[in-house]
């Protein structure tokens, strides 16, 4: 798998928050590629040396996933081809808070963007009529 080293693609993330004990979404989009097999998604977390998640050649590749994320991550595989690299994080923990990097490689080049993910016990505000 080769990429033309210095070409960059646009990657966009959105800061978000996750409710402890529930599932959360870390949003990331990128310039789509024609072939799914040419797309690599790598999610990284600041201070964590293993990968949060990796998706390549149309499927998850979790051999280098860090233990703290084992069994808790997934991408929306059917939406990767249209440029959606968002990560689903199951059973959000307090320690999941921090800075994440969404790193994308395609046949057009590579790109990345960071996002801040907050965690806590959030509740929907009650509206009294």
């Amino acid at each position: 798998f080769g990429i033309s080293g210095r070409h960059s693609i646009t990657v966009t993330t959105v800061a978000s928050a996750g409710n402890i004990g529930e599932d959360g979404i870390l949003s990331c989009t990128f310039e789509p590629d024609i072939k799914l097999s040419d797309i690599v998604i790598q999610w990284l977390k600041e201070g964590v040396l293993g990968l949060v998640h990796e998706f390549k050649e149309g499927k998850d590749e979790l051999s280098e996933q860090d233990e703290m994320f084992r069994g808790r991550t997934a991408v929306f595989a059917d939406q990767v081809i249209v440029g959606n690299a968002s990560l689903r994080l199951k059973n959000v923990q307090l320690t999941d808070a921090g800075t994440y990097k969404c790193y994308i490689i395609t046949s057009k080049g590579k790109g990345n963007a960071n996002l801040e993910y907050k965690t806590g016990a959030f509740s929907m505000p009650e509206v009294n009529v």
Partner: antibody
Framework: EVQLLESGGGLVQPGGSLRLSCAAS????????MHWVRQAPGKGLEWVSA????????YYADSVKGRFTISRDISKNTLYLQMNSLRAEDTAVYYC??????????????WGQGTTVTVSS | DIQMTQSPSSLSASVGDRVTITCRAS??????LAWYQQKPGKAPKLLIY???NLPTGVPSRFSGSGSGTDFTLTISSLQPEDFATYYC?????????FGGGTKVEIK
């Protein structure tokens, strides 16, 4: 000035123990992952162990797993390598090194001067 | 573990020569590759990170290229202070591994 200074090396008998220290200065210690790398006499570089910035995750080469323990004391800005059950093949210069980048994907940009460990009877 | 194979293991060159060292990974490591220079009795020095990027203070005669499994370190015009041993290192896996080294000697 960003600096790493190792200490604790010396001559030890096979089966013995040593604790190496690496004092860090000039940077925010707890935001960087740290490594220990060794170099046997006349040989190449061999990665030994790593620890995340928080100290929550540790990693070891198969050759030292179960014998060596990496740790860090953020209040003292110091990295440690506890070496037990030492063998002749652990004889080397041991370097501590700082990992460049916030996400662990880059190289080791700051190195100490090294401390020599000799395991011999 | 990911194996890193460097070639050649040693080479002789003259000041002003263009020198190329190659590093091959046993599996795809994308651009998670660094190059180091080490002189006798000294600690290694980072030359290149992320396969192509030079840290501040590294002379521009050093350059890195490649992605996937094949990588190259090039010294465009060898200087007297460049005679040393060079190592590649991958950080894709959390079992970090170095290449065996390439010793650059004076012809």
């Amino acid at each position: 000035e960003v600096q790493l200074l190792e200490s604790g090396g010396g001559l030890v008998q096979p089966g013995g123990s040593l604790r190496l220290s690496c004092a860090a200065s000039g940077f925010t210690f707890n935001t960087h992952a740290m490594h220990w790398v060794r170099q046997a006499p006349g040989k190449g570089l061999e990665w030994v162990s790593a620890i995340s910035g928080s100290g929550g995750s540790t990693y070891y080469a198969d050759s030292v797993k179960g014998r060596f323990t990496i740790s860090r004391d953020i209040s003292k800005n110091t990295l440690y390598l506890q070496m037990n059950s030492l063998r002749a093949e652990d004889t080397a210069v041991y370097y501590c090194a700082r990992l460049l980048g916030r996400f662990g994907e880059y190289g080791m940009d700051v190195w100490g001067q090294g401390t020599t460990v000799t395991v011999s009877s | 573990d990911i194996q890193m194979t460097q070639s050649p293991s040693s080479l002789s060159a003259s000041v002003g020569d263009r020198v190329t060292i190659t590093c091959r990974a046993s599996q795809n490591i994308y651009t998670w590759l660094a190059w180091y220079q080490q002189k006798p009795g000294k600690a290694p020095k980072l030359l290149i990170y992320d396969a192509t990027n030079l840290p501040t203070g590294v002379p521009s005669r050093f350059s890195g290229s490649g992605s996937g499994t094949d990588f190259t370190l090039t010294i465009s015009s060898l200087q007297p202070e460049d005679f040393a041993t060079y190592y590649c290192q991958q950080s894709y896996s959390t079992r970090w591994t170095f290449g065996g080294g390439t010793k650059v000697e004076i012809k």
